[in-house]
Interface confidence: medium
């Protein structure tokens, strides 16, 4: 295996440009040996690096052995010689994390990048007056996304003191004593909690304790999902993965595949049915976005898909990223509407629960008043809404969602770009003319998309009289997967919206729904209703139905307002 073979298989100029290192396997035609594309004294080629590049951002990373950057921007470095860099700084006021590309030949913050060839970003402390300053550099795929402060410290390593001594020195012994006591107490608490958790798994109880706030614990008897929610909103950092057996593929999206799966009980043949959303390694960013959204305990809501845990799994195909959630056998709303005609009562329940889910997502507090980060979905559509057994909605697929963090700058918001599904994009998104000064603008785009989904529901409601086959919004005007340009023609140029036939308005309830959704798809974002307002309107509809003593589909509603659905 020498030059002759290489020359025969490769264009000559590539052979000349590459350093001949070990042999090429005989079955590999035109294969680049891993040592070949390098920048070295021999003058071979180096390709630019992919790095996290968010410049300086505020960070919550503190006293951890490693942190994720939480930077959503991956950039291909401008110059081939550049590597990924992360800088962590802490002073009296705040903690910041900087992620950039930088040429290791040049100093950064007055320091030489000594570890530029490392595949991992392992932080080293640098002397800077008035602040704690750590820096790392590395050269592998987005390696500055995971910054490591201590490689020696392993969660199973009891020798914590040794590591702390190395970092802080003996002068910190008194506060260390207190810290270690706290760690031991916390550890005992976690072990105890873990034992309780696993016993909950074994019993498979569906009784749910949701701690909304210290003074607000609500127990819900919930038969809508198999999942024991005690485990919800956890990230599975354990090396031991949940005993899950994938069953059938139930959905496939842009970024991931969704499987129905069996979560086995420790002691028996019993299992709980769960959904597993599997992201390939390339879609790490989508998985992380969704995981970060779900990990917020304050997101918990009956109209938002119940999250169990997130896992990183190694398979023969390479690394995969899993999200494990409740499973809803009725599938997504689009599938459900395609297969079923719905009653007025169904429409009211589906519409009301959808609005409540979005209102909770958008809200800056929980139902109990605890502060919560508002979130915008940015890809609301009928295929991203699941139908629960009681015929209420729950929102799913948060891969494009955005936390409306008050620290986000206008530039950050601008960088989030034109995302979503063209068919459901609001006019201002299609036109890329959102008011980034006002975070409410993002919520208003969700409300537009919600209006189209409400229209889809209404179009399949038998209370309007004649019901046509299911058609998505603008179904007769655009092809199956319309592009932004064709949606611009319909929504912007023609000011088009899905048709509301006049006979729909003969039904008083549907007339009110149509008035509501018309206000929600207004061309002017400021004129649209809020999701909370829509939820309140649906509550009024329910109240009116109760007062009238019957639903308009001639189903009696008991005086107490409880609904008997035998579907």
């Amino acid at each position: 295996m020498g030059r002759g073979l290489l020359r025969g298989l490769w264009p000559l100029h590539i052979v000349l440009w590459t350093r001949i290192a070990s042999t090429i396997p005989p079955h590999v035609q035109k294969s680049v040996n891993n040592d070949m594309i390098v920048t070295d004294n021999n003058g071979a080629v180096k390709f630019p690096q992919l790095c996290k590049f968010c410049d300086v951002r505020f960070s919550t990373c503190d006293n951890q052995k490693s942190c994720m950057s939480n930077c959503s921007i991956t950039s291909i470095c401008e110059k081939p010689q550049e590597v990924c860099v992360a800088v962590w700084r802490k002073n009296d006021e705040n903690i910041t994390l900087e992620t950039v590309c930088h040429d290791p030949k040049l100093p950064y913050h007055d320091f030489i990048l000594e570890d530029a060839a490392s595949p991992k970003c392992i932080m080293k402390e640098k002397k800077k007056p008035g602040e704690t300053f750590f820096m790392c550099s590395c050269s592998s795929d987005e390696c500055n996304d995971n910054i490591i402060f201590s490689e020696e410290y392993n969660t199973s390593n009891p020798d914590l003191l040794l590591v702390i001594f190395q970092v802080t020195g003996i002068s910190l012994l008194p506060p260390l004593g207190v810290a270690i006591s706290v760690i031991i107490i916390f550890y005992c608490y976690r072990v105890n909690r873990q034992q309780k958790l696993s016993s909950t798994w074994e019993t498979g109880k569906t009784r749910k304790l949701m701690e909304f706030s210290e003074h607000c614990a609500i127990i819900l008897e919930d038969d809508r999902s198999d999942i024991s929610s005690t485990c919800a909103n956890n990230i599975n950092h354990n090396t031991e993965l949940l005993p899950i057996e994938l069953d059938t593929l139930v959905g496939k999206g842009r970024f991931a595949e969704v499987y129905k799966a069996k979560l086995k009980q420790n002691t028996s043949e019993q299992f709980e049915t769960v959904a597993v959303k599997i992201f390939p390694y390339e879609e790490y960013a989508s998985w992380k976005t969704e995981k970060d959204i779900f990990s917020d305990i304050n997101l918990k809501h009956e109209n938002i898909l119940q999250f169990l845990t997130a896992e990183e799994r190694k398979t023969e195909l390479g690394k995969q990223y899993w999200l494990i959630t409740a499973f809803h056998a009725k599938g997504n709303l689009q599938e459900y509407l395609t297969r079923h005609v719905i009653s007025w009562e169904d429409l009211r329940k589906l519409g009301s629960s959808l609005a409540r889910g979005i209102a909770h997502l958008h809200s800056d507090h929980t139902p109990c008043g605890r502060p919560k980060m508002p979130i915008v979905h940015r890809d609301l559509k009928s295929s991203n809404i699941l139908v629960k057994n009681d015929l209420t909605c729950c929102l799913c697929d948060f891969g494009l969602s955005l936390r409306l963090d008050p620290t986000l700058s206008v530039d950050d918001l601008a960088n989030s770009g034109q995302v979503g599904t063209a068919r459901y994009m609001a006019p201002e998104v299609l036109e890329s003319r959102m008011n980034l000064e006002n975070v409410e603008s993002f919520k208003q785009t969700d409300v537009y998309s919600m209006a189209l989904v409400l229209w889809e529901m209404t179009s399949r409601c038998n209370a309007v009289g004649e019901v046509k086959d299911y058609e998505p919004p603008f179904g007769s005007k655009v092809r199956e997967h319309p592009c932004v340009e064709s949606m611009k023609d319909n929504v912007l140029r023609d000011r088009g919206r899905p048709e509301i036939p006049s006979f729909w308005l003969n039904h008083q309830g549907i007339q009110m729904v149509c008035e509501t959704l018309t206000e929600c798809w207004d061309h002017d974002p400021e004129a649209r209703l809020t999701a909370q307002c829509v939820a309140e309107r649906f509550s009024e509809l329910e109240h009116l139905d109760r007062l009238s003593g019957r639903s308009c589909s001639e189903e009696k509603i008991p005086e107490d307002g409880s609904l008997n659905t035998t579907k």
Epitope: V28, S31, D35, F47, P80, S140, R254, P280, Y281, G318
Partner: nanobody, 124 residues
């Protein structure tokens, strides 16, 4: 056997357009980030553009931003490069390349397979 076969190159006038294709076989196309890389006469290799396997996120070198568009058709196992507003400095042999799987690669070793290239000449 892994194969990458480029086509679509040729002679074009400045300001003109070309569309390059790269037919891939012998591996699961939907699992890999794919790249276009070029080499101008007498110069080093230069990356042009990259595309993620699913979700179709794209990356471009500054020199081609706004003029070139990378895309892929996973159902046809084909990678494309639409080149508009071509300039003399775009003259090069264009290669499509498959990225090493997973996160095993570094900037020093990014690809495990290349095509044999297609020549694009921009001249009046």
């Amino acid at each position: 056997e892994v194969q990458l076969l480029e086509s679509g190159g040729g002679l074009v006038q400045p300001g003109g357009s070309l569309r390059l294709s790269c037919a891939a076989s012998g591996f699961t196309f939907t699992e890999y980030r794919m790249w276009w890389v070029r080499q101008a006469p007498g110069k080093g290799l230069e990356w042009v553009s990259a595309i993620e396997p699913i979700g179709n996120r794209t990356y471009y070198a500054d020199s081609v931003k706004g003029r070139f568009t990378i895309s892929r058709d996973n159902s046809k196992n084909t990678l494309y490069l639409q080149m508009n507003s071509l300039r003399a400095e775009d003259t090069a042999v264009y290669y499509c390349a498959k990225q090493i799987p997973g996160r095993k690669w570094t900037a020093n070793s990014r690809f495990d397979y290349w095509g044999q290239g297609t020549l694009v000449t921009v001249s009046s």
